[in-house]
């Protein structure tokens, strides 16, 4: 049997294999050692008995999408049946006093990989270590602590495979420099030791995406906007647009990126080198926002055509340091992937390719409350003898839309610990002037927050107010 027969559901066309070469990976045309790694088909009854106490679930994640030329990382996490855990030596043990289908468990081994009779098996250079091999018969690497590695992980994609030892997590990265854009499938099969062989305990696959467009996300925020996720914003207040480029391997770290904005309100094209930009819409309505992100990245040089001279190449910026490499990361408390794959080298040719990313959104602009301010604070005269509470009248004014609700929050002087919160519907005149009366429980300094809201907006102002003692000469003080 070959690797492709054992691992692959998706048959990978030969003409694609030529192009999509992964450095350090091997062709799935290689022979699979069926004696050491028995092959079970989907639905084989042996799967259910491959792990004591239930099934092991493998969870595969990636940091897809990846821009062509960047690295993409895959992580497999093994989830053991209830009441099982990995101990510090990599053995799988039952948790103490944990209730599963078998009742209360004691802290006994489920699988004791490293103890007792197997110890001789780990020695180098003996016939007994012939089984310490991967499915293609390559010997296991032997870095420090490798005996704690309980599992063999076989990653398979693009007609190639990569093998590594690990504990309950394993991580592999590939460089996408030669890969074709589009969705691809990564499959991982996990094996455990079974005497002097290895049996499959879990299989998982996940779609990942390689793209020739820069993956772009934009966050939009605005002061006084009540709901940041509804793409409804307020007129006459700046909206902050922040562009996030998905680039976890920092492939674009040394590339100059330009941002071209069209806000759809006939204000023209804005070109910026900064990932954040403010824009204020001055009309109500619905607008189509368009962003184009552009950068030049290292890429292959076009072959010189006999009829035309080669185009002058853009002066290169220095390659990132270190050179982009494929990483073979590691399982928990385990090495990085000993003698692991190298990543594709950057070509010595200093050509660059323009890459683009696009973002579009439809945003709605409405009128909202733009500003709130406290115009006046007055002490409400109280009958003698004075009660413990002090009453204050606040005159509050606003700009923009008419508020429907007013809230007052009275808190400690740091404005952190709320003591009292009162909200009520309000009716205000065309001038947006309202009077709010609030009681203060005793003398001291208070933080007073006023928020005025309508459907789309929520505007806030704060003041510190000092409530005097009952001495008639002590003045009321407000500190804005």
């Amino acid at each position: 049997k070959r690797f492709r027969d054992v691992l692959g559901h998706e048959q990978y066309p030969d003409h694609m294999r030529e192009h999509n070469q992964l450095r350090g990976w091997s062709s799935d045309e290689n022979e699979w050692d069926e004696h050491l790694y028995p092959v079970w088909r989907r639905g084989d009854g042996r799967w259910k008995d491959s792990w004591e106490g239930g099934r092991v679930q493998a969870v595969l994640t990636s940091d897809s999408p990846a821009l062509v030329g960047s690295n993409i990382t895959f992580v497999v996490n093994l989830v053991f049946p209830r009441c099982q855990k990995e101990d510090a030596n990599g053995n799988i043990v039952y948790e103490k006093n944990c209730r599963n289908d078998l009742g209360l468990t004691s802290d006994l081994h489920v699988y004791n990989w490293t103890a007792g009779a197997d110890d001789g098996d780990w020695e180098d250079g003996t016939s007994r270590s012939q089984h310490l091999r991967f499915p293609d018969r390559r010997p296991f690497p032997r870095p420090h602590g490798w005996k704690k590695w309980s599992f063999v992980y076989v990653f398979h994609t693009l007609g190639q495979y990569f093998q590594k030892l690990g504990r309950c997590s394993a991580r592999v990265s590939i460089n996408t420099v030669n890969l074709t854009a589009g969705p691809q499938v990564m499959e991982v099969t996990v094996f455990r030791r079974y005497g002097r062989a290895y049996i499959p305990i879990s299989k998982v696959k996940d779609v990942y995406v390689i793209t020739d467009q820069i993956p772009v996300f934009v966050t939009m925020s605005q002061k006084n906007d009540r709901n940041l996720s509804d793409e409804i914003f307020l007129r006459d207040l700046p909206i902050v647009f922040d562009v996030l480029i998905h680039d976890p391997s920092h492939f674009l770290n040394d590339s100059a990126i330009s941002y071209k904005w069209n806000f759809g309100d006939n204000t023209g094209l804005f070109v910026s080198n900064n990932h954040t930009l403010n824009h204020t819409y001055v009309l109500n309505g619905t607008f189509n926002l368009n962003l184009t992100v552009q950068t030049a990245v290292p890429g292959p040089c076009p072959p010189p055509s006999p009829s035309t001279p080669p185009p002058p190449s853009t002066p290169p910026s220095p390659p990132p340091s270190p050179l982009p490499t494929l990483s073979t990361p590691s399982p928990s408390l385990m090495p990085t992937g000993y003698k692991s794959m190298e990543l594709s080298d950057i070509s010595n040719e200093n050509c660059r390719i323009n890459r683009y990313g696009y973002f579009r959104a439809t945003i709605t602009i409405v009128e909202g409350i733009l500003e709130v301010s406290i115009m006046q604070i007055a002490d409400v005269p109280m009958p003698t003898p004075q009660p413990a509470n002090s009453l204050m009248d606040f005159t509050v004014t606003c700009k923009g839309a008419t508020p429907m609700e007013a809230c007052t929050i009275i808190s400690d002087p740091t404005c952190q610990i709320a003591q009292n919160r009162v909200c009520s519907p309000v009716a205000v005149d065309g001038l947006c002037l309202l009077s709010v009366r609030r009681a203060f429980n005793g003398s001291g300094t208070y933080c007073v927050n006023f928020t005025l809201g309508d459907d789309a907006s929520l505007a806030l102002t704060s003041t510190l107010i000092s409530i005097p003692g009952k001495d008639p000469d002590s003045p009321l003080r407000a500190v804005n």
Partner: antibody
Framework: EVQLQQSGPELVKPGASVKISCKAS????????MNWVRQSHGKSLEWIGD????????TYNQKIKVKATLTVDKSSSTAYMELRSLTSEDSAVYYC?????????WGQGTTLTVSS | DIQMTQSPASLSASVGETVTITCRAS??????LVWYQQKQGKSPQLLVY???TLAEGVPSRFSGSGSGTQFSLKISSLQPEDFGSYYC??????????FGGGTKLEIK
Amino acid sequence: EVQLQQSGPELVKPGASVKISCKASGYTFTDYYMNWVRQSHGKSLEWIGDINPYHGGSTYNQKIKVKATLTVDKSSSTAYMELRSLTSEDSAVYYCARNWPYFDYWGQGTTLTVSS
Amino acid sequence: DIQMTQSPASLSASVGETVTITCRASENIYSFLVWYQQKQGKSPQLLVYNAKTLAEGVPSRFSGSGSGTQFSLKISSLQPEDFGSYYCQHHFGTPPYTFGGGTKLEIK
């Protein structure tokens, strides 16, 4: 005995760059990932990124706005983090820490102060 | 990214008492959670990984539990050397691996 020895404190001006080092000893340097974590005064910990010393492949936390580049010198078993375009918000203690996906040994920390 | 929320932010206890610190993940992280201890002016130290496994050399009075989104670290019979800050961190899936906000454990 595993040890991660970091370079000393740094005082730099806004806009400047700095390169912090972390010298590993007591284990095979290329066998384990090297992580960088920062801690602003009185705050929690933030993972900045990691590097596989075997071949230099690195991964970064995009959610934090620190401009970091991670490198290694295998011959001296030393990991480096260069921070560029520094602002006062980058003032923090920066730690190197061994392993993936959690960190079993930590350096003593390098205090970076960015101030004009 | 997965968010980690730790509580309480601070805690006072006496030597000999038992305390529990909790950590909540914004999505299912199975058992891929780690706890660190950090003493004033020092580097963090690994206590527990995979939610329940004690790191080498960690006293058995420390125990981790939980899975999915809810986790806790229990310290039985507090010792003077246990006071300091504690942080949870997830280690599920691809990086970044985020930390909780921390819990400061002080002597009462």
